[in-house]
Amino acid sequence: FGISGRHSITVTTVASAGNIGEDGILSCTFEPDIKLSDIVIQWLKEGVLGLVHEFKEGKDELSEQDEMFRGRTAVFADQVIVGNASLRLKNVQLTDAGTYKCYIITSKGKGNANLEYKTGAFSMPEVNVDYNASSETLRCEAPRWFPQPTVVWASQVDQGANFSEVSNTSFELNSENVTMKVVSVLYNVTINNTYSCMIENDIAKATGDIKVTESEIKRRSHLQLLNSKA
């Protein structure tokens, strides 16, 4: 995270990532003021001439907002008084990536902090047994990723084993021509074992686990954003 306390108030940001097509949050907090009317929040983006967003005298002031952010930004107006200047960014675009500045003016003084915002696509993988295949096969699917991720299979029983020779991964471009569907197939699987399909790019890491026994199949998946320091 980035902290700037060289001015008279401290402003804190946290690096984050946005999922293309979904809503994102650019986090920023500051030392609160007693009067909402004394607080000015300005969000800037490096390389952009207009403002990303401005909030002053208790309401949005969008006369200087840059065209690329028109209708896509909002602050949490009811939380500004307690020091929350975070920005909600609607319908995240790939081009929203970059360096942002959260700039705060209050009756106590001024402060600012930068944050790096990454954009891409990431989704939870689902691992299933492929009953149509001639041998015991697992199929790992994740609908939306960008940039193109790496896919690695792992097994609880054969820890450290390299499954690249017995797996096949394909990337299929989605209809919006940016994100891709990830499909990875693992061959020659054995029962009474837990397999993990790990998908990772520079923005996120997602894992889909499947435990296959003679009596049941258990699935679990999780996704983690890989935040870099602002």
């Epitope: 490096e46 952009v48 001439l49």
Partner: antibody
Framework: EVQLVESGGGVVQPGRSLRLSCAAS????????MNWVRQAPGKGLEWVSA????????YYADSVKGRFTISRDNSKNTLYLQMNSLRAEDTAVYYC??????????WGQGTTVTVSS | SYELTQPPSVSVAPGKTARITCGGN??????VHWYQQKPGQAPVLVVY???DRPSGIPERFSGSNSGNTATLTISRVEAGDEADYYC????????FGTGTKLTVL
């Protein structure tokens, strides 16, 4: 090393046109907004124009609006200033400068434009 | 449009402290930058965001900003500091101060 090098200045008659260039190196050009700033002989600094990193948005000083056009070619790392209908009061050293938030952190060495009959 | 006013000249003896002011309506709510320009050279950023120094700029250069006045302070002035100094803010474009000539006596 971050560097900005202006070119294209010269002596031109009133009413004529001139195009200035600014070659950038040492940074990711498309990530940064850029400015043109000028300085008439013996006078102070006067901002002329700014352009966003993508080139999608531009701002102009009232004194040049409608006559000057700022543009950029990110594939060539080059900033331009097309100056039409030049006047004697446009005589100045023209600097290109990299925008950093609300200020400018890197300047070129400048190119001289003289408008005279 | 927004205007920034600076004194035309400031004189100071070597080793002393020079203060250059920049006046503007409620300038304390804006981010102020200062540039040094020596004869025949391009401007150089010496203070940004009111009081921060770019790398390579001596600690002798500092800035402050509140109310209607921003100030550039140069302590232990040297002969090499003799130059024109400009303040600047952003207001839908770069707005420069009128400039101050610093003379080292």
């Amino acid at each position: 090393e971050v560097q900005l090098v202006e070119s294209g200045g010269g002596v031109v008659q009133p009413g004529r046109s001139l195009r200035l260039s600014c070659a950038a190196s040492g940074f990711t050009f498309s990530d940064r907004a850029m400015n043109w700033v000028r300085q008439a002989p013996g006078k102070g600094l006067e901002w002329v124009s700014a352009i966003s990193g993508t080139g999608a948005s531009t701002y102009y000083a009232d004194s040049v609006k409608g006559r000057f056009t700022i543009s950029r070619d990110n594939s060539k790392n080059t900033l331009y200033l097309q100056m039409n209908s030049l006047r004697a009061e446009d005589t100045a050293v023209y600097y290109c400068a990299r925008k950093r938030w609300y200020g400018m952190d890197v300047w070129g060495q400048g190119t001289t434009v003289t408008v005279s009959s | 449009s927004y205007e920034l006013t600076q004194p035309p000249s400031v004189s100071v003896a070597p080793g002393k402290t020079a203060r250059i002011t920049c006046g503007g309506n409620n300038i304390g709510s804006k981010s102020v930058h200062w540039y040094q320009q020596k004869p025949g050279q391009a401007p150089v950023l010496v203070v940004y965001d009111d009081s921060d120094r770019p790398s390579g700029i001596p600690e002798r250069f500092s800035g402050s900003n509140s109310g209607n006045t921003a100030t550039l302070t140069i302590s232990r002035v040297e002969a090499g500091d003799e130059a024109d100094y400009y303040c600047q803010v952003w207001d839908r474009g770069m707005i420069f101060g009128t400039g101050t000539k610093l003379t080292v006596l």
